[in-house]
Amino acid sequence: CRTSECCFQDPPYPDADSGSASGPRDLRCYRISSDRYECSWQYEGPTAGVSHFLRCCLSSGRCCYFAAGSATRLQFSDQAGVSVLYTVTLWVESWARNQTEKSPEVTLQLYNSVKYEPPLGDIKVSKLAGQLRMEWETPDNQVGAEVQFRHRTPSSPWKLGDCGPQDDDTESCLCPLEMNVAQEFQLRRRQLGSQGSSWSKWSSPVCVPPENPPQPQVRFSVEQLGQDGRRRLTLKEQPTQLELPEGCQGLAPGTEVTYRLQLHMLSCPCKAKATRTLHLGKMPYLSGAAYNVAVISSNQFGPGLNQTWHIPADTHTEPVALNISVGTNGTTMYWPARAQSMTYCIEWQPVGQDGGLATCSLTAPQDPDPAGMATYSWSRESGAMGQEKCYYITIFASAHPEKLTLWSTVLSTYHFGGNASAAGTPHHVSVKNHSLDSVSVDWAPSLLSTCPGVLKEYVVRCRDEDSKQVSEHPVQPTETQVTLSGLRAGVAYTVQVRADTAWLRGVWSQPQRFSIEVQVSD
């Protein structure tokens, strides 16, 4: 037999299918020009010493073979003895290791069998009513096709599915969408209405994420506030990566899960922008303010479930950093300025009340004064911190107030509002005899003592009504009792108590008269 012809003799090997799992498969035969044809196949298994034979049976029942040697592709003309206008049955027999392995048969009319391409180029993936929709441009001159898909997950083998007939410039397919696992899809096409025509090769993998992006499983810590008034949010545990099917491992466009960090600064509500979204990889520095944080996972089908946290405000206070002067026109605060052209946010809220009741004021960008201080003033009419109670004050600073992650804490402290010197006056001053020349003076704690760091000391004043001599006794802010000694019996005294802050002298309490009775011996 000539090599270019189909040989109508018995093949040079025994006719027995070994039934082994390896062997030839995916036989495709089609016309490649007006008079030439090609068949190609794949061989699974060790290829050393394998000889392939393309077998062909005509409708008359006569059969022939082409010897392909070790090649898995063979071309022949319409003069090779194979009928191209009538239906023929073709298969491959591979002779290896003294056994024959056979491919599945294909039955087709060769002249009308055109080589079809799989979907080429960009395959668009979208979600439609809980299913996956794939769409692609029909390859040139190949309108009219049957389309199949196969799909697998990381833990399941290939499953075959049908897209149905296609007859347009764009083709599409509805496929199952998995809720929680990624899938790999491949598509193939063949000529529509051409009985027995060969399937194209499988397309490149199309990698599809699950409908629900994986829940972020991250862990955060926040560092302590540094000297610059900022603290770093640190990621202790990265989100778990999505498991991918075999063909999607490595570069798998389409299955990416994006994790975003959403920051909401709860403190200083009068600033322009309260929320910022960042990539999770870029861990921000935060001020000492309170924040709510969310990590949002999303894929090409949209967002998934959030993971949320609250970062409490850093309440470390600096009792000496803030100077407050109260004048007839109003009140002015002074604190060490941060830098040139800084915007400050001054926030205050009554102590012991819900964080939602904080009030704040935003300054215009300001430079330090000659003493290196920044200031904020308000009038009595504004009502700011006007009630006689303890306020917690925090001052934040930023050169770029529109950028949420560039705020820093300047200081946090306590301040007693209103007329502190009068409101802080101790009440219920009482005097009890202690010994023959001493008394114990007690008083109720000043309202200023409810404000950490505000009450500097108590001063107890004792006045001898006879000699008009006055003595003053400083008392620690944690004490509400003092013993006055060296007193003389029968002399009238008055005692008063006041409460002082670092910058304000208190108002004396009402004078309390007392005397030590003269002891008469029997």
């Epitope: 972020p216 810590s221 949010l233 959030n306 993971q307 949320t308 409490p312 405000a313």
Partner: nanobody
């Protein structure tokens, strides 16, 4: 491995009070952020209150002003004081922990360790 055991649940009339306790063992307790979550049958577990190692606290809006959370690091205990209870507070209350500094998880997947829960029933 941290073990958490809740106690203090029970039946109470609306407007009444309960104090839940959570005993922790098996870890450096002060390094853990502790939280209370609750779950009504068939619904997601929801955040109630949380407390950091240095006792900064945070509460769900629905319980703010009624519930307080506290901890005793020496005794490895966390407490949830529940006042002015309402029928909608009826749930299984879970104590949870995560080894973290200064960040209170407000979604259940932010916690690493859980107790078995204690049932709180508030009758109208």
């Amino acid at each position: 491995q941290v073990q958490l055991v809740e106690s203090g649940g029970g039946l109470v009339q609306a407007g009444g009070s309960l104090r839940l306790s959570c005993a922790a063992s098996g870890g450096p307790f002060s390094g853990y952020v502790m939280g209370w979550f609750r779950q009504v049958s068939g619904k997601e577990r929801e955040f109630v209150a949380g407390i950091t190692g240095i006792s900064s606290t945070y509460f769900a809006d629905s319980v703010k002003g009624r519930f307080t959370i506290s901890r005793d690091n020496a005794k490895n205990m966390v407490y949830l004081q529940m006042n002015s209870l309402k029928p909608e507070d009826t749930a299984v209350y879970y104590c949870a922990a995560v080894n973290s500094f200064g960040v209170i998880p407000t979604s259940p997947n932010g916690m690493d360790y859980w107790g078995k829960g204690t049932l709180v029933t508030v009758e109208p």
